[in-house]
Structures are given as C-alpha cells and as structure tokens.
C-alpha cells in the first residue's frame, strides 16, 4: 500500500492561473497511489462542483483534471485538489484570476489562412482561427470575376459566400474543398463578426495541373505555403 | 432610403423611467447590430450601448451599467433603449446608430448610419 | 478604456486654406487584420454626425476628396486641403476597436 503522491509535479508548478474572462482554464493533479485515490476539488476551501457556475464544469477523474470553460470574475478564488486514499492525502492549491477585457472586434490568428499550392484533384482545408469575446459569426468568402472585372464600380471586390457558420469563440473554422479544379484557383476570405465588429483575412489557393505520375510518385498531394 | 428614425423622448424627474425606440427602414435590419449614442447639451459624443444582430449579445457603458437595456425586435425592425433610474447626467440627445453587418462590408462596418436622435431631459 | 485626445479645441480658417485637426488615443488602434480603426465624423449645427473618414484613411461615399485622413497605431490626422464654408462644425475622431467605443472631445471649425 502507498500513500497518494504527484505523478507530475512538474505540470504543477504554475500555481497563479491569470487568464482572459472568457478563456478556458484547465487544473491538473495527476497522482497515483496504492489503493488508486479518488480527487476531489475544492474552491475557497468548500467542496466544489460547480452547480452554480454557468456553463458548469467538468471533471476528468482519470486525467485528474478540472476545466471551466469561458471563465468570469466570479470564478476567481482559491481551487484545491484534493487526493485521498485510505492510506494518507496530499492537496495542492491553484489561485485563478479572472483578467477582465473590453470586448473587442474579432482578432485573427496571423497567417491563416494561408496561401497554399495544391494540385488538380487533391482536397484542400483553409483554417481560420478566431478569438472573440462576443460569439462570432464566421463568412468564408471566394473573390470572383464578373464580365471580366474582380471589382465593382464602386470599387468594391465581388465576393461569393461559400460558408456560413456560427462557431464559440477560440475554435477553429475549416473550408473544406474537395476535388480541387483550376476554376477553385483563387483569393479567399475569412471573414469574421461580431457585435463590435467584422474582421477578415484572405488567402491565395494555386492549382497546379495534375502532375505526371511517372516522376511524381513520392511528391505530396497538397502542398502548403506561407 | 437607409433610414433610423428614434422617438420616445421627453421630460423626465430623476429615478424615473423612460422607454426609446429607433424604427430602422431601406436596409436588412436582422443583418445588422445596432448601437445607442448620446450627446449631452454642447457636449461631445458618448457610446451608450450595442446589441448584436440576433440580440445575443449587448455591451453597457459603464456610466448606464445596470440602469440601461437594450433590446430588439427584428420582426418589426425596432431598437430599444429602456432607462431606468434616470439622473440628471443622462440628460442628452439619443442616438440610434447601424453597427456592423454579417456580410462583406462594402465599406465601413458600421457607424455609418445615424438617426436624427430624440431628447430626453431629466430634471426635477 | 481607451481615450481618444484630439487637438486644437477650436480651428478658425481661411476659406480655400488647409486645415489639420490631430487625435491621439491611449492604445493601438491597429488591429491584427492590418486595418487601424479610427473613424472620423463631422456634426454640423442641428444635425447628428456624418462620417467622413473610415479605417484610418478611406472616405466615406459621397465625401469631397478634399477630406483625407492618415496615421498610424496612436496618432492620427484629419486634413481638409481646402476650406470651404460648408466644413463649419465639429470635428470627431472614434475608436471603433473595442467597447466602450470612445470619441474624441472635438474640433470646433470655424471660418475667418
């Protein structure tokens, strides 16, 4: 028999959590034992399960883990896990701080999309990563020609929306495009919005003619470029 | 014709409670979320409140936080304003301004669009 | 919050002279998309205002090309080439980055 101890110690040592509101925060205490310990948690020292969190919890006995996604002031405290077995228990306390913002217009990750080479046939996937402290809304967007022009007289580009979504803030949104022909070679947008603002990035996909598979025969279908 | 037309304002005692509406017309008002403004007598512009297209979201400043609410009504393409516990200090011209749309933005994304405002005066 | 600081209070100008009205905020307006996202405004007497100026440097449909606006991240400037009677009003820039968004105090223009 063996009292609980901590399996990682060292995914332990940062003990002041200060995230965005909105953020998700995830605490571990992986441990182990003879009996294997239960873990229970605790917020400001009183047993917590979160029926009075919106959004709730969740707890992943077997990753030793606690996470609250889309964390608010009222979420700071103290949080304690606790691990028991019937030999002995350790504890180990995190502090959270609950950083507030100003909501702002959707940021963009830097460099998604990103221009990429693909050759006819293949599939291709476009990312667009979104952080957004109100939810989002997300347009993906081809750039087209139109009598032989890609700009109105208003001096505005025409667009075709390919995708429509709704997504929750920090996911990532993916255009798929199956089957790629030289008529997908162009510019395409992410555009994403939300109550304060919109917010888009644009990228370049390049078709290339199917390859002669006598000297290709090891070359990648897709090829990704910055 | 891209128009916002407010009403409801008035004279109102301090701690009393007022109601504006913006009636928007010649656009997708569903599309589009939607902001309040005001201006107090020979003052600058303040930001008051906005409101998602959907009404998910709104955001307060924190000079009408708790007091204030906005809302919406897509079926009938109507913004609200209801204040509450009004002072003094919210004496000022309302205005009802067009925010961001859900599409490309053929131009700015919003902000680009007022009403004519309406008055409200608190005053005891 | 971020504060928007504008410079002159007050502008008396020539008419078919050129006038400059400066605005400083308290944060980067520079957002990751590239664009700078400062709006500019005119009111004139009785009326709500009316945008001139969106994103930094593009004119809004309808506005004279005697309008331009510039800078970068902090600073930014309203020009007029040349003064006309009808520019008489107040002035305000707006960060429209983040809530609360927040104007400038304004520029009142005015005609020698």
């Known amino acids: 028999q063996q009292a609980p101890y901590w399996t990682h110690p060292q995914r332990m040592e940062k003990k002041l959590h200060a995230v965005p509101a909105g953020n998700t925060v995830k605490f571990r205490c992986p441990a182990a034992g003879n009996p294997t310990p239960t873990i229970r948690w605790l917020k400001d020292g009183q047993a917590f399960h979160g029926e009075n969190r919106i959004g709730g919890i969740r707890l992943r006995h077997q990753h030793w883990s606690l996470v609250m996604e889309s964390v608010v002031p009222s979420d700071r405290g103290t949080y304690t896990c606790l691990v028991e077995n019937a030999v002995g228990s350790i504890r180990y306390n995190y502090l959270l701080d609950v950083l507030e913002r100003s909501p702002h217009r959707p940021i963009l990750q830097a460099g998604l999309p990103a221009n990429t080479t693909a050759v006819v046939g293949s599939d291709v996937e476009l990312l667009c990563k979104v952080y957004s402290d109100a939810q989002p809304h997300i347009q993906w967007l081809k750039h087209i020609v139109i009598n032989g022009s890609s700009f109105g007289a208003d001096g505005f580009p025409y667009v075709q929306v390919l995708k429509t979504a709704d997504i929750n803030s920090s996911e990532v949104e993916v255009l798929y495009l199956r089957n790629v022909s030289a008529e997908d070679a162009g510019e395409y947008t992410c555009l994403a919005g939300n109550s304060i603002g919109l917010s888009y990035q644009s990228a370049w996909l390049t078709v290339l003619p199917e390859e002669d598979p006598t000297w290709t025969a090891a070359a990648p279908e897709a090829r990704y470029t910055d | 014709e891209v128009q916002l037309l407010e009403s409801g304002g008035g004279v109102v005692q301090p701690g009393r409670s007022l109601r504006l509406s913006c009636a928007a017309s010649g656009f997708t008002f569903s599309s589009y979320a939607m902001h309040w403004v005001r201006q107090a007598p020979g003052k600058g512009l303040e930001w008051v409140a906005v409101?998602?297209?959907?009404?998910?979201?709104?955001y307060y400043a924190d000079s009408v936080k708790g007091r204030f609410t906005i809302s919406r009504d897509n079926s009938k393409n109507t913004l609200s304003l209801q204040m509450n516990s009004l002072r003094v200090e919210d004496t000022a011209i309302y205005y009802c301004v067009r925010g961001a749309g859900r599409g490309f933005p053929y131009g700015p994304d919003g902000f680009d669009i007022w009403g004519q405002g309406t008055m409200v005066t608190v005053s005891s | 919050d971020i504060v928007m600081t504008q410079t002159p209070l007050s502008l008396s100008v020539t008419p078919g002279q050129p006038a400059s009205i400066s605005c400083r905020s308290s944060r980067s307006l520079l957002h990751s998309d590239g664009k700078t996202y400062v709006y500019w405004y005119v009111q004139k007497s009785g009326q709500p205002p009316q945008l001139l100026i969106y994103?930094?440097?593009n004119r809004f449909s309808g506005v004279p090309d005697r309008f331009s606006g510039s800078g970068s991240r902090t600073d930014f400037t309203l020009k007029i080439s040349r003064v006309e009677a009808e520019d008489v009003g107040v002035y305000y820039c707006?960060?429209?980055?983040?809530?609360?968004?927040?104007f400038g105090g304004g520029t009142k223009v005015e005609i020698k």
């Open positions: 707006m960060q429209y980055i983040e809530v609360p968004l927040t």
């Open positions: 409101i998602s297209y959907d009404g998910s979201n709104k």
């Open positions: 994103e930094l440097s």
